[in-house]
Amino acid sequence: EEELQVIQPDKSISVAAGESATLHCTVTSLIPVGPIQWFRGAGPGRELIYNQKEGHFPRVTTVSDLTKRNNMDFSIRISNITPADAGTYYCVKFRKGSPDHVEFKSGAGTELSVRAKPSAPVVSGPAARATPQHTVSFTCESHGFSPRDITLKWFKNGNELSDFQTNVDPAGDSVSYSIHSTAKVVLTREDVHSQVICEVAHVTLQGDPLRGTANLSETIRVPPTLEVTQQPVRAENQVNVTCQVRKFYPQRLQLTWLENGNVSRTETASTLTENKDGTYNWMSWLLVNVSAHRDDVKLTCQVEHDGQPAVSKSHDLKVS
């Protein structure tokens, strides 16, 4: 009788991560008696994937009923494939022996390739806020994709950015890959409503590229401009002085009035008005009793914005 052959008809198969992979194997004879085992890889370091006789292989099922007397189909199905399952799988026939079975013949092997989608890109910005005209860095990361080829683009409000550096790791062969990119963005006063977008395209994506976003509202600090003005006299001996705090972001702001360097009143900004560009305006007023002063009064509006050093604007009130 012709010697047993182990036939693995598929030289290579490709499977999407999360799906099942069927590895086909048939033998041409029932002789010699002995089990079939599946391995990933060859040589002494090979990994046992399935043993017909013993062991627990929760992700592996046989395609045929191996208990049937004349069964010659030893194909297996591996469920929930991940990139880590990639490799060459060998169907190996053993001859019954004592105490151990002896390897008799191996199939030619089936290379399993796994395609995996990139994870949703995560964009992160600087730890501390920065002011307009400063350059800040944003990073974008996506993981777990295969094959290695991937494209990454950066956008600010729909306009493609060019100042970025991207790395795909590892450089050599791997079961899956990660991408890391850093983009530099110059902030402007109008960026409170702006968005930075990282877009990743890969062969496995049936839809549009995956996008990760960062709102510049979490990165930018727009310092206020101050204007102190004296209003017309409201009543005899009383002057109304206002401090206009304009175009600031974020909202956190504390204002202190000083009369000739002495603290008159401190208040925290509330009932702000929002500008179209996302910045805020606020106005504080101080009623000064002129009759309490014999000399001219120096009024100072001092603003501490978002924990930054105070800025101030003064106004000299003439007492005549």
Epitope: S12, T151, Q206
Partner: antibody, heavy 116, light 109 residues
Framework: VQLVESGGRLGQPGTPLTLSCTVS????????MGWFRQAPGKGLEYIGI?????SPYYASWVNGRFTISKTSTTMDLKMNSLRSEDTATYFC?????????????WGPGTLVTVSS | DIQMTQSPSSLSASVGDRVTITCRAS??????LAWYQQKPGKAPKLLIY???FLYSGVPSRFSGSGSGTDFTLTISSLQPEDFATYYC???????????FGQGTKVEIK
């Protein structure tokens, strides 16, 4: 799983024409779909694709002449102004489940003839 | 745009012959290459994807190889039903566009 093109006919130069691709056995919201054409006795030519979310992408030569759109069960190819060189069999196809680099299911095609 | 050059444009062969068709890309497309078979008046049929993976239901006499710019479709033993036109098709992962070769017509000798 099946694709069937329709709408092919004799059209006059300068007139618009819309072709449809009706799908069954799968959801258009899960796959990229493509349009291709083949002039008589010539090779296959890529026109464009539409992503699972409905964004169209076109071959560089299309230059706004064609528009791809879709509903839940059909994908359309609108030809804005027919030219004689648009005479061809038009095919729709679906990309494979593993990725967008190949097309594993094709419709039988619909013939468009442009002549005055 | 990437150009795909297929050769030969036609060939004559007999049943049982080994047939090889090549496809060359004008720039690297890694392994993003598919092969299709088309018969007159019919739609193309996918044979090979990712340069070397046999599509389900396709006979094992068809095989593909290559990566980068040079690719090969081999029919190990030509059968009567294999007389048809064969096309290669590339996908470029940066431009995300597709290009076909001009086709190879396999005729009966």
């Amino acid at each position: 799983v099946q694709l069937v093109e329709s709408g092919g006919r004799l059209g006059q130069p300068g007139t618009p024409l819309t072709l449809s691709c009706t799908v069954s056995g799968f959801s258009l919201s899960s796959y990229v779909m493509g349009w291709f054409r083949q002039a008589p006795g010539k090779g296959l030519e890529y026109i464009g694709i539409i992503s699972s979310s409905g964004s169209p992408y076109y071959a560089s030569w299309v230059n706004g002449r064609f528009t791809i759109s879709k509903t839940s069960t059909t994908m359309d190819l609108k030809m804005n102004s027919l030219r004689s060189e648009d005479t061809a069999t038009y095919f729709c196809a679906r990309v494979g489940p593993l990725g967008v680099d190949y097309f594993n299911i094709w419709g039988p095609g619909t013939l468009v003839t442009v002549s005055s | 745009d990437i150009q795909m050059t297929q050769s030969p444009s036609s060939l004559s062969a007999s049943v049982g012959d080994r047939v090889t068709i090549t496809c060359r890309a004008s720039q690297s497309i890694n392994s993003y290459l598919a092969w299709y078979q088309q018969k007159p008046g019919k739609a193309p049929k996918l044979l090979i994807y990712s340069a070397s993976f046999l599509y389900s239901g396709v006979p094992s006499r068809f095989s593909g190889s290559g990566s980068g710019t040079d690719f090969t479709l081999t029919i190990s033993s030509l059968q009567p039903e294999d007389f048809a036109t064969y096309y290669c098709q590339s996908w470029h992962y940066i431009s995300r566009s597709y290009t076909f070769g001009q086709g190879t017509k396999v005729e009966i000798k």
